[in-house]
């Protein structure tokens, strides 16, 4: 995904997980200069910004995801010990210095571990 100096690649657009797993929302980007990276989460319960940062600087993590998310300079984020309510749409937006952006969507499905699955 390339536009006006920003490119963004999402290797896996749909992720299936079970509760308590740590999940990597993996992306790769390239652009001229240092971009602003923003992740938002949306579900039927609403939408919220998870985190925003410029690579190489401290990430501004929302209160709802404090201690539950970790950022990487390649734009990826890791979610710790996910629950069913973490299911939904995760949209990354990479914005370069001149103002143009690229976005991509990852859908996360989190399911309970069923007893019969363990046997």
């Amino acid at each position: 995904l390339q536009s006006q100096g920003v490119s963004l690649y999402i290797p896996q657009a749909t992720i299936n997980a079970t509760v308590k797993e740590d999940i990597l929302l993996s992306v790769e980007y390239s652009c001229h200069g240092v971009p602003t990276i923003e992740w938002t989460y949306s579900s039927n319960w609403g939408t919220q910004k998870i985190v925003e940062w410029k690579p190489g600087t401290q990430a501004n993590i929302s209160q709802s995801h404090k201690d539950r998310v970790c950022t990487f300079d390649n734009g990826s984020i890791q979610l710790f010990s996910v629950g069913v309510r973490d299911s939904g749409y995760y949209v990354i937006t990479v914005t370069e210095r001149l103002g143009s952006s690229q976005f991509g969507t990852i859908v996360l499905h989190v399911s309970e571990i069923l007893y019969e699955d363990l046997h």
């Epitope: 995904l1 390339q2 749909t14 938002t40 579900s43 690229q102 991509g104």
Partner: antibody, heavy 123, light 108 residues
């Protein structure tokens, strides 16, 4: 009823500029993404640019190579597409299109369409 | 970018027949991020389906969308005379937003 009216199209020479204006009515303008989609003569639909409502994020097609700039004025219910260094291949009917109301997810599909304004780039 | 390939390019059918239009994406895309449009000469395109399978306001029940992963389908259960047009699919899961090349449904 949502109405989108485009203006500013015309005939220009390669390398020249044009400014397209889209004026909207019948919607809470500041809650909607606004997009430009074009159709070259005999061709299919091609997305050009989008501007979100809340975040103001801006997206462009790769082929534009920095030549176009989109902006919005919520007070005037309008969106402008500034087109510079125009090329023959930019010749098309340019549609202004609203997305769905921004509720809980970025949804850049195209709900309400204007009738389009024709841009012809010819030497 | 995600490339959308529509087939067939042209579909020649009679009123009352069932039309099945295909849209294939170059990368797996959540069905929630696919839309279908109808375009008639001299008119603006019209949104038919969004979210893969949701009919837009005012769209008759004979239009339905389905599919997941990389394969999506628009079905017109029984063609009416006003349904003969060009149909486009569009993905909006990632930028750049992209359209398929279109399928023309014409009268046999």
């Amino acid at each position: 009823e949502v109405q989108l009216v485009e203006s500013g199209g015309g005939v220009v020479k390669p390398g020249e500029s044009l400014r397209l204006l889209c004026t909207a009515s019948g919607l809470s303008f500041n809650k909607y993404s606004i997009n430009w989609v074009r159709q070259a003569p005999g061709g299919g639909l091609e997305w050009v640019s989008s501007i979100e409502s809340g975040s103001g994020h801006i997206y462009y097609a790769d082929s534009l190579e920095g030549r176009f700039t989109i902006s919005r004025d919520n007070a005037k219910n309008s969106v402008t597409l500034e087109m510079n260094s125009l090329r023959v291949e930019d010749t098309a009917l340019y549609y202004c299109v609203s997305g769905p109301e921004d509720k809980w997810l970025l949804q850049l599909y195209f709900e309400s369409w204007g009738q389009g304004t024709l841009v012809t780039v010819s030497s | 970018e995600i490339v959308l390939t529509q087939s067939p390019a042209t579909l020649s059918l009679s009123p009352g027949e069932r039309a099945t239009l295909s849209c294939r994406t170059s990368q797996s895309s959540p069905s929630d991020n696919l839309a279908w449009y109808q375009h008639k000469p001299g008119q603006a395109p019209r949104l038919l389906i969004y979210g893969g399978s949701n009919r837009a306001t005012g769209i008759p029940a004979r239009f339905s969308g389905s599919g997941s992963g990389t394969d999506f389908t628009l079905t017109i259960s029984s063609l009416e005379p006003e349904d003969f047009a060009v149909y486009y699919c569009q993905q909006y899961g990632s930028s750049p937003l992209t359209f398929g090349g279109g399928t023309k449904v014409d009268i046999k």
